[in-house]
Interface confidence: low
């Protein structure tokens, strides 16, 4: 299980990654682009009942497949720094994006990278010293490999392997919300929101203008960035004269709670600062922007509320699919629950279980969601993203079902197609009670742990739970060990 999440000490470094319904109005009342990719991989989104274009696509497909006999497909996304150099990373270097085009496809996947944030001069300086690539484009490699949902291999990405793939590196440290340039007054630029807008503008000249669907995806801070920017992208495209491009969102591990910390701590650094405190400070420091419709719901100075998924989601026009671990490591970190390899105290254990319950509650009215009961952080650009299941359905399958569903503008509960669910939230109550969760390793020994070992390590009370379930403790342990 190489490449899977390891159970590491929190607080050492922030987690970093290595991407219907309210759509923008459309000129031509056009269809969407959900297709059963798992069973028929040709991208029919480019075929509009026109046989000539279909044959051209087949020819293009044949030509593109020809080199495969001699060499492996080039999986790399290539770096393009923004031509508009006034849209910058924190240090004033030009922002950019990595692109891998797929000529036959009218689907575009734009992925926002994650990597925490900084919210004052002190912790931004420290971030610049230790994680410069998250604040500057100066040392970015020329290419990146697409993994998970950014992979062009059908085996690794049964959902959208044939899409045009765009990876937008995170170098604004502002949860993709800022719109303030570097100046004499501001040591750093915070232009996350403007970076997204500028990338979209430049991509229009590279084929995005012919897109049917633009899926704005992101993990961690990038996932929150999706919630903050998806409607603005839709508005931009409509303003620029592309109202028929359907804009959707996919927010992975960016649905945070503004809950009470397990142990209250002063807001000294990024990872110990309570979520609300960090965002309150950040939004002022970044001149952060939030979606207009959400902003209208809160009075001046209260815009920070819109950084929290369950508050901003009901105000969004574009359909958004929410992917969130019920026991998210970043959430636990900011809540001061540090699982340091020692069995947790009872108070922590109850806090963790309650977090799962609270999170489940906030997803109740989210029409499209995938929330496994695992202790982890981020998933969609992990190579193992196809392995995790909720109620027997994998994430790529759920996304495929969502693609086909075209849920309505109010996100009212619509019955999904039989056997094709896309509201998938685990109901079992503790971390890793889902047997398909990413493998856990003991951070000291590097040893893989099975579910039973992990839960006992966490202080799971086998005796009590067995009693509640009306079974022998040994039977419950056996079930857990077998992954049931």
């Amino acid at each position: 299980s190489e490449g899977r999440k390891t159970w590491r000490r929190r607080g050492q470094q922030p987690p970093q990654p290595p991407p219907p319904p309210p759509l923008p109005q459309r000129a031509e009342v056009e269809p969407g682009a959900g297709q059963p990719v798992e069973s028929f991989p040709l991208d029919f989104t480019a075929v509009e009942g026109n046989m000539d274009s279909f044959m051209a696509q087949v020819k293009s497909l044949a030509q593109s497949l020809y080199p495969c006999s001699a060499q492996q497909l080039n999986e790399d996304l290539r770096l393009h720094l923004l031509l508009n150099t006034s849209v910058t990373c924190n240090d004033g270097s030009p922002a950019g994006y990595y692109l891998k085009e797929s000529k036959g496809s009218r689907r575009w996947l734009l992925f926002l990278e994650g990597g925490w944030y900084c919210f004052n001069r002190e912790n931004c300086d420290s971030r610049y010293d230790t994680m410069r690539r998250l604040m500057s484009s100066k040392d970015w490699p020329h290419t990146r490999t697409g993994t998970g949902i950014l992979s062009s291999q059908p085996e690794e990405n049964p959902h959208w392997w044939n899409a045009n793939m765009v990876f937008i590196p995170y170098c604004s440290s502002d949860v993709w919300s800022g719109a303030s340039p570097k100046s004499d007054k501001n040591e750093y630029a915070f232009m996350g929101s403007l970076i997204i807008q500028e990338v979209v503008r430049e991509l229009l000249g590279k084929g995005l203008s012919g897109a049917k669907v633009l899926l704005l995806a992101g993990s961690s801070a990038g996932g929150t960035g999706v919630l903050l920017n998806v409607d603005r992208v839709a508005e931009l495209l409509e303003e620029l004269g592309y109202p028929s491009i359907q804009v959707r969102g996919l927010a992975d591990s960016g649905w945070f709670l503004d809950n009470k910390q397990y142990r209250r701590s002063d807001c000294i650094d990024t990872i110990n600062c309570a979520p609300t405190d960090a965002i309150r400070r950040g939004i002022r420091y970044w001149s952060g922007m939030v979606p207009e419709r959400c902003q209208r719901q809160f009075k001046e100075g209260e815009e920070w509320n819109c950084f929290f998924g369950y508050k901003v989601y009901p105000t969004l026009r574009c359909p958004v699919f929410v992917v969130q671990w019920l026991f998210d490591e970043a959430q636990l970190t900011v809540d001061n629950v540090h699982l340091t390899g020692q069995p947790v105290q009872e108070g922590q254990w109850l806090y963790i279980q309650n977090l799962g319950r609270e999170l489940r509650g906030t997803l109740k009215d989210v029409q499209a969601s995938f929330a496994p009961a695992c202790l982890s952080h981020e998933i969609i650009i992990r190579s193992y993203w196809t392995d995790v299941q909720v109620k027997g359905t994998s994430l790529p399958r759920a996304l495929h079902c969502w693609d086909r569903s075209f849920h309505d503008s109010h996100k009212a509960s619509k019955t999904p197609m039989k056997g094709c669910p896309f509201h998938l939230v685990d109901s079992c109550p503790w971390p890793h009670c889902n047997p398909s969760c990413p493998t856990i390793r003991d951070q000291f020994t590097g040893q893989e742990m099975n579910v039973a070992q992990f839960l006992m390590h966490m202080g799971f009370d086998v005796q009590t739970v067995a009693q509640q379930q009306g079974m022998e403790p040994s039977k419950l342990l056996g079930m857990l060990s077998n992954g049931n």
Epitope: P20, P22, L23, E30, P31, G32, G49
Partner: antibody, heavy 119, light 111 residues
Framework: EVQLVESGGDLVKPGGSLKLSCAAS????????MHWLRQAPEKGLEWVAY????????SYANTMKGRFTISRDNAKKTLSLQMTSLRSEDTAIYYC????????????WGTGTTVTVSS | DIVLTQSPASLVVSLGQRATISCRAS??????????MHWYQQKPGQPPKLLIY???NLESGVPARFSGSGSGTDFTLNIHPVEEGDATTYYC?????????FGSGTKLEIK
């Protein structure tokens, strides 16, 4: 309650003009594309015109192009249809309807306003 | 323009039985797994009311007695069991491309 209410229907002579209005309430009007549709007496439904949420896209049925103009005022939550060079075949009940974000169907309809073109 | 042919023009069904209305498009209205066909009910003196969208999705608040199916060019609206209040006119509409067009309607009578 989500509601659309049309007004402005009247009896008008052939070649005349008329402006129809549609007042929206109960939803964020500025988020939705809007349509005008019509129904001649004892006849079926016919699409007239479409305007996108920000007025960037306007579209008309062929027989109405050049004679009808669709517009909206998001601040006032109103949709309008300016009709000129009216013909007897334009006699109908005119409905405004909200376009659902996905799929192009009409999920909210007004009650209609009657336009009669006759000499 | 895509022409929708609705049949039958009128239909008489016994109370509690099944009513089936068909709609055929001159060109496919399905694409990429979606079928852009919708069904409306219109009672005299009232505007149309959305029943089914995207071929088979029941609009919220509409009784489960109504169901839709089909793809490509052939679509069906089923009402079962039929109730007295269902006696009115039904229209299909496509939104595959502009202009959206409607079928000529089916008048349902209950005996």
């Amino acid at each position: 309650e989500v509601q659309l209410v049309e007004s402005g229907g009247d009896l008008v002579k052939p070649g005349g003009s008329l402006k129809l209005s549609c007042a929206a309430s109960g939803f964020t009007f500025s988020d939705y594309g809007m349509h005008w549709l019509r129904q001649a007496p004892e006849k079926g439904l016919e699409w007239v015109a479409y305007i996108s949420s920000g007025s960037t896209t306007l579209s008309y049925a062929n027989t109405m192009k050049g004679r009808f103009t669709i517009s909206r005022d998001n601040a006032k939550k109103t949709l309008s249809l300016q009709m000129t060079s009216l013909r007897s075949e334009d006699t109908a009940i005119y409905y405004c309807a909200r376009k659902n974000y996905n799929g192009g169907y009409f999920d909210v309809w007004g009650t209609g306003t009657t336009v009669t073109v006759s000499s | 323009d895509i022409v929708l042919t609705q049949s039958p023009a009128s239909l008489v069904v016994s109370l509690g039985q099944r009513a089936t209305i068909s709609c055929r498009a001159s060109k496919s209205v399905s694409e990429s797994g979606y079928s852009y066909m919708h069904w409306y009910q219109q009672k005299p003196g009232q505007p149309p009311k959305l029943l089914i969208y995207l071929a088979s999705n029941l609009e919220s608040g509409v009784p489960a007695r109504f169901s839709g199916s089909g793809s490509g060019t052939d679509f069906t609206l089923n009402i079962h069991p039929v109730e007295e209040g269902d006696a009115t006119t039904y229209y299909c509409q496509h939104s595959r491309v502009l202009p959206p067009t409607f079928g000529s309607g089916t008048k349902l009578e209950i005996k």
